[in-house]
Interface confidence: low
């Protein structure tokens, strides 16, 4: 029978019907011109699940610098400013696309790579496992 | 700084500086093989600043499907399960790279594009402006 093609949002690297090599113009078009440049820059401090931003640098990757969020506490900050361990600070992770130089050190040849980054933290109710 | 020698097996490039147009292999390498596949998938419901995920689809973009977080409430969920408007649910936004077909409808020609996406929500203390 005929296989229904996979949704193009989930490309299959083994799929023969997906182009292997393409030309990419690195002159970035930024579609965020109307957004507030400060955006969520102060949320990391004001959140009930605050986080620190760590610089992850890799010259073989484009972009070479990515900022990773690390939650400051296991718990969340309560109204008194104390850490409440009945709640959990957890990282919100997202898969993003980056370009990886391939072969290594090549100036104009890349492979798409999917990496998981932590963007910030949120406060969640813990999953409680009751012992029978 | 130390210059990394160019790999002799690299494709030829006319641009001696940072390349404008590069070759990209779309056979995605996924570096997240050791991560928990569930990841943060249930955080959107368990968070004190819960969010819904909206599908953003654009066939001229790669990836063509991106999920956008929209915070459910203006306030945050308190210990009683009610919305507390003394706190604010805010989206955590991240700039990500996508590929945009250029010229439009071309099968193997893209431009890098930076777009702002909301990944999830976090609960923050509001900024209170005191009137003098």
């Amino acid at each position: 029978g005929i296989t229904i093609p996979r949704n193009p949002g989930c490309p299959n690297s083994e799929d023969k019907n997906f182009p292997r090599t393409v030309m990419v113009n690195l002159n970035i078009h930024n579609r965020n011109t109307n957004t507030n440049p400060k955006r969520s820059s102060d949320y990391y401090n004001r959140s009930t699940s605050p986080w620190n931003l760590h610089r992850n640098e890799d010259p073989e990757r484009y972009p070479s610098v990515i900022w990773e969020a690390k939650c400051r506490h296991l718990g969340c900050i309560n109204a008194d400013g104390n850490v409440d361990y009945h709640m959990n600070s957890v990282p919100i992770q997202q898969e993003i696309l980056v370009l990886r130089r391939e072969p290594p050190h090549c100036p104009n040849s890349f492979r798409l790579e999917k990496i998981l980054v932590s963007v910030g933290c949120t406060c969640v109710t813990p999953i409680v496992h009751h012992v029978a | 700084g130390i210059t990394i020698p160019r790999n002799p097996g690299c494709p030829n490039s006319e641009d001696k500086n940072f390349p404008r147009t590069v070759m990209v292999n779309l056979n995605i390498h996924n570096r997240n093989t050791n991560t928990n596949p569930k990841r943060s998938s249930d955080y959107y419901n368990r968070s004190t600043s819960p969010w819904n995920l909206h599908r953003n689809e654009d066939p001229e973009r790669y990836p063509s499907v991106i999920w956008e977080a929209k915070c459910r409430h203006l306030g945050c969920i308190n210990a009683d399960g009610n919305v507390d408007y003394h706190m604010n649910s805010v989206p955590i936004q991240q700039e990500i790279l996508v590929l945009r077909r250029e010229p439009p409808h071309c099968p193997n020609s893209f431009r890098l594009e930076k777009i702002l996406v909301s990944v999830g929500c976090t609960c923050v203390t509001p900024i209170v402006h005191h009137v003098a």
């Epitope: 229904i4 949002g9 | 689809e57 654009d58 066939p59 071309c106 020609s109």
Partner: antibody, heavy 111, light 107 residues
Framework: EVQLVESGGGLVQPGGSLRLSCAAS????????IHWVRQAPGKGLEWVGW????????NYADSVKGRFTISADTSKNTAYLQMNSLRAEDTAVYYC????PDMWAMDYWGQ | DIQMTQSPSSLSASVGDRVTITCRAS??????VAWYQQKPGKAPKLLIY???FLYSGVPSRFSGSGSGTDFTLTISSLQPEDFATYYC?????????FGQGTKVEIK
């Protein structure tokens, strides 16, 4: 199974109108482009136009511009070709065809 | 509009023959070329896309090559079911345009 089923063809007088339908099934309609391509008796293939059901964007061949309109109803997964001011040279078999964005060729055609 | 010129317009060949059809674009179309097979009374079927990628389910005796302005469809060993008309098509710019077709007949 991916399917495109055309309907609505018939005999019409010069200057008349006709609406063709292309019912799609077995795939995400909004993730594709739908093309209309025609073939006059004993002749080759001629592209008529396309639509992105996702955005509603359309594009037409010069030979039909202003006379033909392509539309889509995403709730019905159906594309339409409205043909007005028909001429003798529009006599042809009309095919609808699907184009997935990550291939840019027409991989499924109606019959 | 970009013109796609196919040659020959028709050819006679025998089962087992190697058949080559060429397509020339009036301007550079990178590798944005597809090849289709059409039998009488039937809709076209995709064989090759992006100049050289074999579409799934298409026998490996079909191959495509080329970039820029010159493209080739090759059938390495002609089979009885391959007697049909073949079209090239560019999708580099709007409007997409087809070649005039090459009819492959039994010798």
């Amino acid at each position: 199974e991916v399917q495109l089923v055309e309907s609505g063809g018939g005999l019409v007088q010069p200057g008349g109108s006709l609406r063709l339908s292309c019912a799609a099934s077995g795939f995400t309609f909004t993730s594709t482009a739908i093309h209309w391509v025609r073939q006059a008796p004993g002749k080759g293939l001629e592209w008529v136009g396309w639509i992105y059901p996702y955005s509603g964007n359309t594009n037409y061949a010069d030979s039909v511009k202003g006379r033909f309109t392509i539309s889509a109803d995403t709730s019905k997964n159906t594309a339409y070709l409205q043909m007005n001011s028909l001429r003798a040279e529009d006599t042809a078999v009309y095919y609808c065809a699907r184009q997935v964005p990550d291939m840019w060729a027409m991989d499924y055609w109606g019959q | 509009d970009i013109q796609m010129t196919q040659s020959p317009s028709s050819l006679s060949a025998s089962v087992g023959d190697r058949v080559t059809i060429t397509c020339r674009a009036s301007q550079d179309v990178s590798t944005a070329v597809a090849w289709y097979q059409q039998k009488p009374g039937k809709a076209p079927k995709l064989l090759i896309y992006s100049a050289s990628f074999l579409y799934s389910g298409v026998p490996s005796r079909f191959s495509g090559s080329g970039s820029g302005t010159d493209f080739t469809l090759t059938i390495s060993s002609l089979q009885p079911e391959d007697f049909a008309t073949y079209y090239c098509q560019q999708s580099y710019t709007t409007p997409p345009t087809f070649g005039q077709g090459t009819k492959v007949e039994i010798k």
